[in-house]
Interface confidence: low
């Protein structure tokens, strides 16, 4: 007996071939011997089966001795043995219809769990193997669970359902609702304008919700809310904004904030949260601001950074086109009695410059010896 696997809602073609390549009489029946379809001469006839309105045959192939039965919009209950009677033989085909669906919405927040449920005919023991867009393989039986979705899990999940050494493939599109980055750091010289961007890792036709940016300045003992906003059909409207700093927010996606100038008192880290309508939980993105200041005070040239920097970052002071005079894995460096000229303060990570500030050193009059 031939086994054919089908997908719920899909179309399947059960083949049946006569030994002679010519049109002859045939019938398709179910296991209860109820006629589904057949022919009378060149006409397709249908029987009293519940399948009849969804069953068809390729009349164009009858002359070649091919008497297939096509079943549209498959249902799990269509799983049974079908019999093709042609010439003096009976061909049995066992059709097994499976359905694989996501238990919840296919739009899930990062960190939420995805459950896939397999619908299968009674008496079968299929195995399911799914591959996520990032290459992780999971396997199971009637249910498959992915406990904590990451943004890289967005995309098409390919699942293979196997039974009796046959396989049917399902593709399920999952959208993980998250920001493109979990965290980002902006490096700025003191006084420069700061742009914070929070691009989303998904697109939805209607995007509605509300959000807030909380900020923990390095110099402050507690965090405070900087801005709250609403999102209606991808339009952003500010509800409330702090007066220090005077933040501005873009009216369109991606979410965009502008800080008029980077100052040491603003250096720190923020957490932007976005609550989407009809979704439990919130999307988060961390943003860090690192501010650099280079100053000359009398015979002392100082470079300082504020904000969340890794201990691996190196701060250097160097005279233009010369080797660094001082380098340190610290947040402040200085040079005493610097030579006159253009000095550079560099914040770097393994040789890659993250932030640079130039300062012109003017000669400091040396005190006259008595």
């Amino acid at each position: 007996k031939k086994v054919v696997l089908g997908k719920k809602g899909d179309t399947v073609e059960l083949t049946c071939n006569a030994s002679q390549k010519k049109s002859t009489q045939f019938h398709w029946k179910n296991s209860n011997q109820i006629k589904i379809l057949g022919n009378q001469g060149s006409f397709l006839t249908k029987g009293p089966s519940k399948l009849s309105d969804r069953a068809d045959s390729r009349k164009s192939l009858w002359d070649q001795g091919c008497f297939s039965m096509i079943i549209k919009n498959l249902k799990i209950e269509d799983s049974e043995t079908y019999i093709c009677e042609v010439e003096d033989k009976k061909e049995e085909v066992e059709l097994l219809v499976f359905g694989l669906t996501a238990n919840s919405d296919t739009h899930l927040l990062e960190g939420q769990s995805l459950t896939l449920t397999l619908e299968s005919p009674p008496g079968t023991s299929p195995s399911v193997k799914c591959r996520s867009p990032r290459g992780k393989n999971i396997q199971g039986g009637r249910t498959l669970s992915v406990p904590q979705l990451e943004r890289q899990d967005s995309g098409t999940w390919t699942c293979n359902v196997s039974q009796d050494q046959k396989t049917v493939e399902f593709k399920i599109d999952i959208v993980v609702l998250a920001f493109q980055k979990a965290s980002s750091t902006v490096y700025k010289k003191e006084g420069e304008q700061v742009e914070f961007s929070f691009p989303l890792a998904f697109t939805l036709e209607k995007l509605t919700g509300s959000g807030e940016l909380w900020w923990q300045a390095e110099r402050a003992s507690s965090s405070k809310s900087w801005i709250t906003f609403d999102l209606k059909n991808k339009e952003v409207s500010v509800k409330w904004v702090t007066q220090d700093p005077k933040l501005q927010m873009g009216k369109k996606l991606p979410l965009h904030l502008t800080l008029p100038q980077a100052l040491p008192q603003y250096a720190g880290s923020g957490n932007l949260t976005l609550a989407l309508e009809a979704k439990t939980g919130k999307l988060h993105q961390e943003v860090n601001l690192v501010v650099m200041r280079a100053t000359q005070f009398q015979e002392n040239l100082t470079c300082e950074v504020w904000g969340p920097t890794s201990p691996k970052l190196t701060l250097s002071l160097k005279l233009e086109n010369k080797k660094a005079t001082v380098s340190k894995q610290a947040k402040v460096v200085w040079v005493l009695n610097p030579e006159a000229g253009m000095w550079q303060c560099l914040l770097s990570d393994s040789g890659q410059v993250l932030l640079e500030s130039n300062i012109k050193v003017v000669p400091w009059p040396t005190p006259v010896q008595p």
């Epitope: 195995s127 193997k129 990032r134 290459g135 992780k136 393989n137 396997q139 039986g141 990451e150 890289q152």
Partner: antibody
Framework: QVQLVQSGAEVKKPGASVKVSCKAS????????ISWVRQAPGQGLEWMGE????????YYNEKFKGRVTMTRDTSTSTVYMELSSLRSEDTAVYYC???????????WGQGTLVTVSS | DIVMTQSPDSLAVSLGERATINCKAS??????????MNWYQQKPGQPPKLLIY???NLESGVPDRFSGSGSGTDFTLTISSLQAEDVAVYYC?????????FGGGTKVEIK
Amino acid sequence: QVQLVQSGAEVKKPGASVKVSCKASGYTFTAYVISWVRQAPGQGLEWMGEIYPGSGSSYYNEKFKGRVTMTRDTSTSTVYMELSSLRSEDTAVYYCARSGDGSRFVYWGQGTLVTVSS
Amino acid sequence: DIVMTQSPDSLAVSLGERATINCKASQSVDYDGDSYMNWYQQKPGQPPKLLIYVASNLESGVPDRFSGSGSGTDFTLTISSLQAEDVAVYYCQQSLQDPPTFGGGTKVEIK
């Protein structure tokens, strides 16, 4: 055909770090998880962690958390495993392995012997 | 972590005879009708080679004298007729729960 080629043997002093590479070829590098498994002399096999070359995300065995870092370079189809604060008991052959479905290891590198000795 | 215990530690079998290796998991490695147990062969100086996956499935290219059985916590690898090239260390490994864990190994020799 699928190949995983690892870097050569290393001798390190206690407290130092070692970085072992695993260059993949013969398949789409970003599509398969790579695990690292080690084997001390005359001992059994121990899973250290895995990396998803597509995203760079990695998951570590709790035993090695804080000491192991797994990274990848998609431009060269290479995965790296760095183990820090080495001690004599870290002397082992370190294997990279490509996972099949779930955590079963179908393709293996040839192994890299790391010796930690003062 | 799931602890895997193999027995015996070593095994000497005559050529053409049957070799049986046992593996016990500290908790069930079954999930929804499948047993997440794999078996590997390792020869000196070589990496392990996958023989059996999900308890009883033979990996492509592996001779059919190798077979796996068992469920729950108790599993067996059988070599129906030992050949000279089967001399090696054999490891069981569970893949149900992270971290994946291996048995201590069973050394198979010719008597």
